[in-house]
């Protein structure tokens, strides 16, 4: 069908509550494009009827709510005047219960579930709520160890819990809860956050922390397009360089002639105490020679790698 396949990393989410994923892939989605969502290579698009539990809302896919059987690979097809890209998103649903905020044992958890407060400082936790404009979110309530948080040191400000003069006792399991309203119906969103305390100034001193990747392998089909983000947290005043290397050479230099594998433009999000940097690596077309090679993300003295591997053969096809 002429569409380029792009594989995104897994999303791990909670059953029985709303979830939304936005199909954005700059610079493709910045122009005049159409976006269509599909599930598990189905030819039938996800419904656009807002009464449907799972439906497409502009560029988003929206689950109201997410259920056990919703795990799987979803594709959004972005069609432009001269291009077509198919983005694959692997959604894994796990059973999540009220007050079950200790989810650190799960693989590939995003940094949204693990946050850090800095001892003796005024700091904040963020409740990550990503939904389309059609969803109205009510005020957020915060809990620690299943009890609502209160006290003069805690202030709720939009999606953040401000904690003044952080103490060692502020570590532990938190949850933020909001009521989401969509088409007159109300749903509860509850996110668990494991909070640790650091004594170091800034965000982890001068050593940057690579959140993703985590020295792991990624299954990818031969010939496909793959984009992998390197997410790094570092102090606001850091002078560290962030880059992708292979065989101890910058990827842009290593693939200078073919330009088949390129490093993306670095972006960052600024938080009060630290910055979150993202720099991706794009494999325009995965070749046999790419398998088994460690592609290293460097951030100052910190490193983490990914290794591409061929998916195990699916013998059911024979």
């Amino acid at each position: 069908d002429g569409c380029k396949d792009i594989f995104m990393k897994n999303e791990i989410l909670s059953a029985s509550q709303p979830f939304a994923f936005n199909c954005t892939f700059p610079p493709i989605t910045s122009g005049e494009v159409s976006v269509t969502w599909y599930k598990n290579s189905s030819k039938i698009p996800v419904s656009k009827i807002i009464q449907s539990r799972i439906h497409q809302d502009e560029t988003w896919i929206l689950f109201l709510p997410m259920e056990w059987g919703d795990s799987g690979v979803y594709q959004c097809v972005i069609k432009g005047r001269d291009s077509c890209h198919r983005i694959h998103v692997n959604l894994t649903v796990f059973e999540k219960h009220w007050c079950d905020t200790s989810i650190g044992g799960l693989p590939n958890l995003s940094d949204e579930y693990k946050q850090i407060l800095h001892l003796g400082k005024d700091d904040s936790l963020t409740c990550h709520l990503h939904f389309p404009k059609s969803c109205v979110l009510g005020p957020i309530k915060w809990y620690k160890d299943c009890n609502e948080i209160k006290g003069e040191r805690f202030t709720v400000l939009e999606t953040r819990l401000l904690v003044s003069n952080v103490s060692a006792e502020d570590r532990g399991n938190y949850a933020c809860q909001a009521i989401l309203t969509h088409s007159g119906k109300q749903y509860e969103v509850l996110n668990g956050i494991t909070v640790s305390i650091t004594e170091r100034a800034g965000y982890g001193g001068s050593v940057p922390k690579i959140i993703y990747p985590k020295n792991h392998s990624i299954e990818v089909q031969l010939g496909t397009t793959l984009i992998v983000d390197c997410n790094v947290t570092d102090t606001k005043d850091n002078t560290n360089l962030r880059c992708w290397r292979v065989n101890n050479t910058l990827v842009d230099d290593y693939y200078d002639e073919s330009k088949r594998i390129r490093e993306g433009v670095e972006t960052h999000v600024s938080f009060r105490e630290h910055n979150l940097y993202t720099v991706n690596i794009t494999f325009l077309e995965v070749k046999m020679e790419d398998y088994g090679l460690p592609f290293m993300c460097h951030a100052g003295v910190s490193t983490a790698y990914i290794i591409l591997q061929l998916p195990a053969p699916d013998f059911r096809a024979y």
Epitope: H97, W98, D100, T101, S102, C146, N147, K150, G151, N173
Partner: antibody
Framework: QVQLVQSGAEVKKPGASVKVSCKAS????????MNWVRQAPGQGLEWMGM????????RLAQKFKGRVTMTVDKSTSTVYMELSSLRSEDTAVYYC?????????WGQGTLVTVSS | DIQMTQSPSSLSASVGDRVTITCRAS??????LNWYQQKPGKAPKRLIY???SLDPGVPSRFSGSRSGTDFTLTISSLQPEDFATYYC?????????FGQGTKVEIK
């Protein structure tokens, strides 16, 4: 360092009341719930209830409603638990336990003996 | 109210033995469960927070795990100082409830 220091042992007659204190130090007193747990001789642990020093919100186990009063003195970072209409089966060690992180720290315990 | 059923109520073991104690919750409590050790005349001491997080200073021979509503405290190699009574506590919803306790005695 977090410390919870409780008042000394008490001997009371049936029908009387007892007030046990728990003085907290080493953490932000008004930020976390304080629990009360009791343990009868040779028996297990029993949760009685909890109070939040910030606004004195109290939650009690059903069996203690009407007999237990929990109060706070923010100026001295002290929580009090008063148990009225004492009976012999109330003879127990009474503990306060802070919920800085779910029942992390415990007082040393206060033995209350109810005897005629 | 959530009931916590702890087993066994007592066990005899030797130094070096692997010991497991189980608590079963009558309904889902997520990971909101602690384990405590209590010695005679002393206040309970928390060993494990939120099912599996070891408290600072607690030896690594202690570990906690969960399967559904079944929770396990494991002592990988029993030491002389481990002979005590152990309790689980659920704090998912009030009224909070403890298991009945397990007394670990010397064989």
């Amino acid at each position: 360092q977090v410390q919870l220091v409780q008042s000394g042992a008490e001997v009371k007659k049936p029908g009387a009341s007892v007030k046990v204190s728990c003085k907290a130090s080493g953490y932000y007193f008004t930020s976390y719930w304080m629990n009360w747990v009791r343990q009868a001789p040779g028996q297990g642990l029993e949760w009685m209830g909890m109070i939040h020093p910030y606004d004195s919100e109290t939650r009690l186990a059903q069996k203690f409603k009407g007999r237990v009063t929990m109060t706070v003195d923010k100026s001295t970072s002290t929580v009090y638990m008063e148990l009225s209409s004492l009976r012999s089966e109330d003879t127990a060690v009474y503990y306060c336990a802070s919920s800085t992180t779910a029942f992390a720290y415990w007082g040393q315990g206060t033995l209350v003996t109810v005897s005629s | 109210d959530i009931q916590m059923t702890q087993s066994p109520s007592s066990l005899s073991a030797s130094v070096g033995d692997r010991v497991t104690i189980t608590c079963r919750a009558s309904q889902d409590i997520g990971n909101a469960l602690n384990w405590y050790q209590q010695k005679p005349g002393k206040a309970p001491k928390r060993l494990i927070y939120a099912t599996s997080s070891l408290d600072p200073g607690v030896p690594s021979r202690f570990s906690g795990s969960r399967s559904g509503t079944d929770f396990t405290l494991t002592i990988s190699s029993l030491q002389p100082e481990d002979f005590a009574t152990y309790y689980c506590l659920q704090y998912a919803s009030s009224p909070y409830t403890f298991g009945q306790g397990t007394k670990v005695e010397i064989k």
